[in-house]
Interface confidence: low
Amino acid sequence: DFGLDCDEHSTESRCCRYPLTVDFEAFGWDWIIAPKRYKANYCSGECEFVFLQKYPHTHLVHQANPRGSAGPCCTPTKMSPINMLYFNGKEQIIYGKIPAMVVDRCGCS
Amino acid sequence: DFGLDCDEHSTESRCCRYPLTVDFEAFGWDWIIAPKRYKANYCSGECEFVFLQKYPHTHLVHQANPRGSAGPCCTPTKMSPINMLYFNGKEQIIYGKIPAMVVDRCGCS
């Protein structure tokens, strides 16, 4: 699997992974104890036909061209978890692995 | 996890899974021995904020609103493989499990 990495200076218009630091304090999410900030990243860009297609299925749907099927879009194709310390709804402190919090790779699907 | 199922009679505008039978013979893909047709399904529809979001990450990116980040799009969130019998480039017959050929569920990511 392959995915492009970009930053805010990139001229790349195609589907790419961009850096993004999520700041829970800035959001006012005070129930999150740690981390206060983390690198989440995000996906953005155009999905030209066949470029960075994760699945053969994407190509097949394009070929079949059913009613209402949009072209593929730039979306996370690989994600990883982070460990977090937070208050749950009962004000108990929880330490747990939260899945799919970091984008590792972007692709067209 | 939850995803909507629709068909061509549905009035649903939101992200939904639709039926699609892929016909390799109709495509002229004569290197595929079996199956000649299979149920692939596809995703289509609008992703209103928070509807069918697969990842908390999607919500966080929306909250952070970085430059160039599009809204989430309707894409497969669960896929399954099928086994296929096909000729490879060297005219050898291969039997193998091809991942992500069937859309089981759609969501916004």
Epitope: - | P19, T21, P35, R37, Y38, K39, I82, K97
Partner: antibody, heavy 122, light 110 residues
């Protein structure tokens, strides 16, 4: 040998209960959709319900609430629990396996048991 | 729920004749249609799936066609062993919430 064998049929009084079993051999139970279909004497096929690969169950509208499908992977067996039985439930009950189209288990059935007769009568 | 209607109810033909059985769905079912053959005292046997794909071991004289709401099973040259009741079946879109059989067509040999 790949096969399905139903058991548990017999005579039961109206209002009674019965549990049918379907023992599978020669394949992995959880890799396939399993269905129950019945056939009243001299009549057509009538779908009762299925249990899919994930273990989710779906039923014909008339069967909901009275009939329950379950499976025990360790025993390689699928069950049909039938409650509040009526005379019109008299039929041969077939267990069937979803057709495997190269790894994708469909909801049509290519492997059937011989069936077990259930007679509801006082 | 989808309702499947088969016609005719009974058909009596001579060996070698061409047989055409019809199955109509109350709403579009795309290609989600199967055909079964059932002989007395036996369980059904899958003949056709996805409207036109021949199941393993089924003779090539059996042919399925159609999509949407109208489907046909054709036996190009009727053989004595083809005497049976034929059922169509759908699996109700892609939701897997329902399976429906037609009421069957009985094929007799003259």
């Amino acid at each position: 040998e790949v096969q399905l064998v139903e058991s548990g049929g017999g005579l039961v009084q109206p209002g009674g209960s019965l549990r049918l079993s379907c023992a599978v051999s020669g394949f992995t139970l959880s890799h396939y959709v399993k269905g129950w279909v019945r056939q009243a004497p001299g009549k057509g096929l009538e779908w009762i319900g299925i249990i899919n690969i994930e273990g989710e169950t779906y039923y014909a509208s008339w069967a909901k609430g009275r009939f329950t499908i379950s499976r025990d992977n360790s025993k390689n067996t699928v069950y049909l629990q039938m409650n509040s039985l009526r005379a019109e439930d008299t039929a041969v009950y077939f267990c069937a396996r979803g057709h495997d189209n190269f790894g994708y288990s469909y909801h049509d059935f290519n492997l059937w048991g011989q069936g077990t007769l259930v007679t509801v009568s006082s | 729920a989808v309702v499947m209607t088969q016609s005719p109810a009974t058909l009596s033909l001579s060996p070698g004749e061409r047989v055409t059985l019809s199955c109509q769905a109350s709403e579009s079912i795309h290609h989600e249609l199967s055909w079964y053959q059932q002989k007395p005292g036996q369980p059904p046997k899958l003949l056709i799936y996805l409207a036109s794909t021949l199941a393993s071991g089924v003779p090539s004289r059996f042919k399925g066609s159609g999509s949407g709401t109208d489907f046909t099973l054709t036996i190009s040259s009727l053989q004595p062993e083809d005497a049976a009741t034929y059922y169509c079946q759908t699996y109700d879109g892609i939701s897997h919430y329902g399976v429906a059989f037609g009421q069957g067509t009985k094929v007799e040999i003259k």
